[in-house]
Interface confidence: low
């Protein structure tokens, strides 16, 4: 299953399959997730080691048993790959690292006014993988405001150095935010020239294209079909690059197929997995296990559940079958692709779905009327769980926020439905940033069921929580995916990086905002909060957040939306925007429903509604 916990001051011994430099443990974990053999990783922050060569070292590891012995190492961080973790699988990494220079091949230098602009330039440059920006206070005046665009052979920095007044980060192309746009065309009977960065065997050009999309240096590809004239090159997928970023030439060539990486696509990237099953095809590789199962789909499920399995062949040979069950060969290789592909066999083959974003139909848990005042504009995909709850009577308007917590589930505040309990009048918009983008043609979800907490009473602040079951499940994308829920009764975690988002009022007597707003707000203890609200009971099932001096808060129209906190690299839904005295007033923090206190209720309702488990804990 999915394991998300991180082990601090621990280092996994042995099992190394690759090593690289990464700026933090979360990026290291992402590289582990996308590496075909990596199950575990260990990361050495700069503070954890004197050896300059090993600082920022990210060590990717494999283990036949799925685990390795842990040794104590102060400052080290270790953890698991997020293979099998559904919507948590993403190559998108938005963080900016201050005081860090990520080294690589500097191929472009320009003057820009901010690190955000530098990141945007990197995202809009076909070859840029990461960047460094020298701030206005950099010690050498001639380098100030320099934006260095970089690449490296493996897509990760060739070295990482601690350097004051330098900020570094990665291209947001894997977040589907590139302005370049992409070529979806597949060119039949055409071979591209230029440098081969890798060679893998694939059953078709579409798998070849997906592999190219997620390979750090692949910009385009040529695939040799299974009837290509040279037998040894059949099913070969050549991943290619060039200095210019496009093929310098192409040759008409029968039985070849060429195309481009889809990494520069805007708003949608292919899933990093291959779900198609190939009948009459055998995939060769290292044998992991052989099991008898009923049907090729069960064989694929078995491969997906066995985390080391990369691909499989289901044999229908009479000698491989007993009654209704036949042999399911679970296999792996060094690069995650078959070592040979044979046609005209009595087998069916395919790939593990361990890297599919969709995962199962579950809500995510881990061991993670009121708008934003004093906030700033959000960007695409920054808060992909945020939804807008709108009511369509004569006109249509935004009333509340909500949080996507599963394919078919939204968590919001109960008070959003005060006087409007009719499910037919509601429209739920997900994967949006600007309310003005919503037209009559914009797709929306309708409500199948509104589940208001049984102890909620109108005009009281207690138990202000409601679940919405959508009529149809949503697909996950970089712009529409769920937020993880905290553990039941999560009281021990100290959250220091919390944000509230919404389209609500920007001042007490304001109006709904067009662009989704965000504001960073510190949590306040319940004791402190109670002092500020002497006329109300602040219960243990509430959580408060706000600045003593005011100025930043949720406000009308943000109700039901998320209070999220980042801990160990993962966002968790800590609160649901509920109530407060005015908006952003001095010494009047916002009050939020504490999600951890309602985990039993959420589990019970999401499970009983379908009669099957809807929640899964990656831990």
């Amino acid at each position: 299953g999915c394991l998300t916990q991180l082990y601090e001051n621990a280092f996994f011994r042995g099992g190394d399959v690759a090593s690289m430099y990464t700026p933090n443990a979360q990026y290291c974990q992402m590289r582990c997730t996308f590496h075909p053999r990596c199950l575990l990783f260990s990361f050495l922050p700069a503070s954890s080691i004197n050896d300059m060569e090993k600082r920022f070292g990210c060590f990717l590891k494999d283990s036949v048993t799925g685990t390795l012995p842990k040794v104590h190492r102060t400052g080290a961080v270790s953890g698991h790959s997020l293979k099998q973790c559904g919507h948590q699988i993403s190559a998108c990494h938005r963080d900016i690292y201050k005081g860090v220079d990520m080294r690589g091949v500097n191929f472009n230098v320009s003057k820009v006014s901010s690190v955000e602009e530098c990141q945007k330039r990197c995202t809009s440059n076909i070859r840029c993988q990461f960047f460094s920006y020298a701030t206005q206070t950099f010690h050498k005046a001639e380098y100030r405001n320099n934006c260095l665009l970089k690449y490296s052979p493996g897509g990760t920095p060739t070295a990482i150095k601690v350097l004051s007044n330098v900020e570094s980060g990665f291209s947001l192309k894997p977040c589907a935010l590139s302005e370049i746009g992409c070529h979806m065309n597949i060119f039949q009977h055409l071979a591209f020239s230029d440098v081969d960065v890798a060679r893998v065997l694939t059953p078709d050009a579409f798998v070849c294209r997906t592999i190219c999309t997620y390979h750090p240096n692949c910009l385009f590809f040529t695939f040799y079909t299974n009837v290509w004239k040279i037998e040894s090159q059949r099913n070969v997928c050549l991943l290619k690059t060039s200095e210019s970023g496009t093929p310098s030439s192409s040759t008409p060539q029968e039985n070849t197929i060429s195309g481009y990486s889809l990494l520069t696509c805007k708003r949608t990237l292919p899933e990093p997995c291959h779900s198609k099953i190939y009948p009459g095809v055998d995939f060769g590789g290292e044998e992991l296990n052989v099991t008898f199962v009923k049907g090729v789909n069960v064989c694929q499920e078995t491969c997906t559940k066995m985390i080391r399995c990369q691909f499989f062949t289901y044999s229908l040979l009479p000698e491989d079958c007993k009654e209704e069950k036949c042999k399911c060969f679970l296999r792996l290789s060094m690069d995650g692709s078959p070592t040979r592909i044979a046609y005209g066999t009595q087998g069916s083959s395919g790939y593990s779905l361990r890297l599919c974003n969709t995962g199962d139909n579950s809500v995510c848990t881990t061991k993670t009327s009121t708008r934003i005042v004093g906030g700033t504009n959000s960007s695409w995909g920054e808060w992909p769980w945020q939804v807008s709850l709108q009511v369509k009577l004569t006109a249509q308007r935004h009333l509340c926020g909500g949080s996507l917590i599963g394919h078919q589930w939204v968590l919001t505040a109960a008070h959003c439905f005060d006087g409007l309990p009719l499910q037919d009048v509601w429209r739920i918009y997900s994967g949006i940033l600007n309310l003005s983008d919503i037209t009559k043609d914009t797709p929306f979800s309708q409500i199948k069921e509104i589940i208001i907490h049984q102890n909620y009473k109108v005009s009281e602040g207690n138990h202000d929580i409601a679940l919405i079951k959508l009529q149809a499940p949503l697909n996950y994308t970089e712009f529409q995916k769920p937020i993880c829920l905290p553990s039941k009764g999560d009281t021990s975690t100290i959250y220091t990086n919390c944000w509230v988002t919404g389209w609500g009022f920007s001042k007490e007597k304001g109006e709904i905002q067009n662009i989704l707003q965000k504001v960073n707000i510190p949590l306040v203890t319940n004791e402190e909060c109670q002092k500020r609200y002497q006329d109300y009971k602040i219960t243990q099932r509430m959580v408060c957040a706000g600045y003593k001096e005011g100025g930043k808060d949720a406000c009308k129209g943000d109700s039901g939306g998320p209070l999220v906190c980042k801990h160990n690299g993962m966002w968790r839904l800590v609160g649901i925007t509920s109530w407060g005295e005015g908006c952003a007033r001095r010494e009047q923090p916002g009050v939020y429903t504490k999600v951890a206190e309602y985990m039993d209720w959420i589990l019970e309702k999401t499970q009983s509604s379908d009669g099957k488990a809807q929640m899964q804990s990656p831990a």
Epitope: M20, V105, D196
Partner: antibody, heavy 120, light 107 residues
Framework: EVQLLESGGGLVQPGGSLRLSCAAS????????MDWVRQAPGKGLEWVSS????????SYADSVKGRFTISRDNSKNTLYLQMNSLRAEDTAVYYC?????????????WGQGTMVTVSS | DIQMTQSPSSLSASVGDRVTITCRAS??????LNWYQQKPGKAPQLLMY???SLQSGVPSRFSGSGSGTDFTLTISSLQPEDFATYFC?????????FGGGTKVEIK
């Protein structure tokens, strides 16, 4: 012109160490897997070690595992082979070669070789 | 590891002769077979990859065939510059392995 140039060979006593270098020119070094292959006097070719473009992934022949370390410096277009605990059977001409993929793992560019003699 | 066995280990031939060298793998390597030519005191050079694909600049008198475990290198009309040692190599799996070599000498 695409070229690989080895250096660092010589005479060393058993148990000693040597570091071989291979300077690459004429191609984008950082895009290619690089390998060391050796040839004992009058004998055939034996693959020794590979290093992938980023330097993060390496592999070794069983005969040298734990004693030899392959590394690269992409900024200097240079490949290295650190050889420790040398034995008489390591005596050979050591070639650096560029890894090439289309026909399965092959070596399309070779250096001229550097001689390593392990003898007391 | 996959063993590669070349035969003969040496042969004598004259200019213009048709020469055939065989290479056998201890297990199937599909078509991941490469051939190299090495002249005395020089480094090997890639001659052919993927059984029969000629590396650029290699004359068409060289050809390759086979698949699975048995492979053949043929020189249709031996030229003076072809006198050398030829090695086969499997590129199917790590570790890559070479044949023992076939020395083609002047008769």
């Amino acid at each position: 012109e695409v070229q690989l140039l080895e250096s660092g060979g010589g005479l060393v006593q058993p148990g000693g160490s040597l570091r071989l270098s291979c300077a690459a020119s004429g191609f984008t070094f950082s895009w290619y897997r690089m390998d060391w292959v050796r040839q004992a006097p009058g004998k055939g070719l034996e693959w020794v070690s590979s290093i992938w473009p980023s330097g993060g992934l390496t592999s070794y022949a069983d005969s040298v595992k734990g004693r030899f370390t392959i590394s690269r410096d992409n900024s200097k277009n240079t490949l290295y082979l650190q050889m420790n605990s040398l034995r008489a059977e390591d005596t050979a001409v050591y070639y650096c070669a560029r890894g090439w993929a289309p026909g399965g793992d092959a070596f399309d560019i070779w250096g001229q070789g550097t001689m390593v003699t392990v003898s007391s | 590891d996959i063993q590669m066995t070349q035969s003969p280990s040496s042969l004598s031939a004259s200019v213009g002769d048709r020469v055939t060298i065989t290479c056998r793998a201890s297990q199937s390597i599909s078509a991941y077979l490469n051939w190299y030519q090495q002249k005395p005191g020089k480094a090997p050079q890639l001659l052919m990859y993927g059984v029969g694909s000629l590396q650029s600049g290699v004359p068409s008198r060289f050809s390759g065939s086979g698949s699975g475990t048995d492979f053949t290198l043929t020189i249709s009309s031996l030229q003076p510059e072809d006198f050398a040692t030829y090695f086969c190599q499997q590129g199917y799996t790590t570790p890559v392995t070479f044949g023992g070599g076939t020395k083609v000498e002047i008769k």
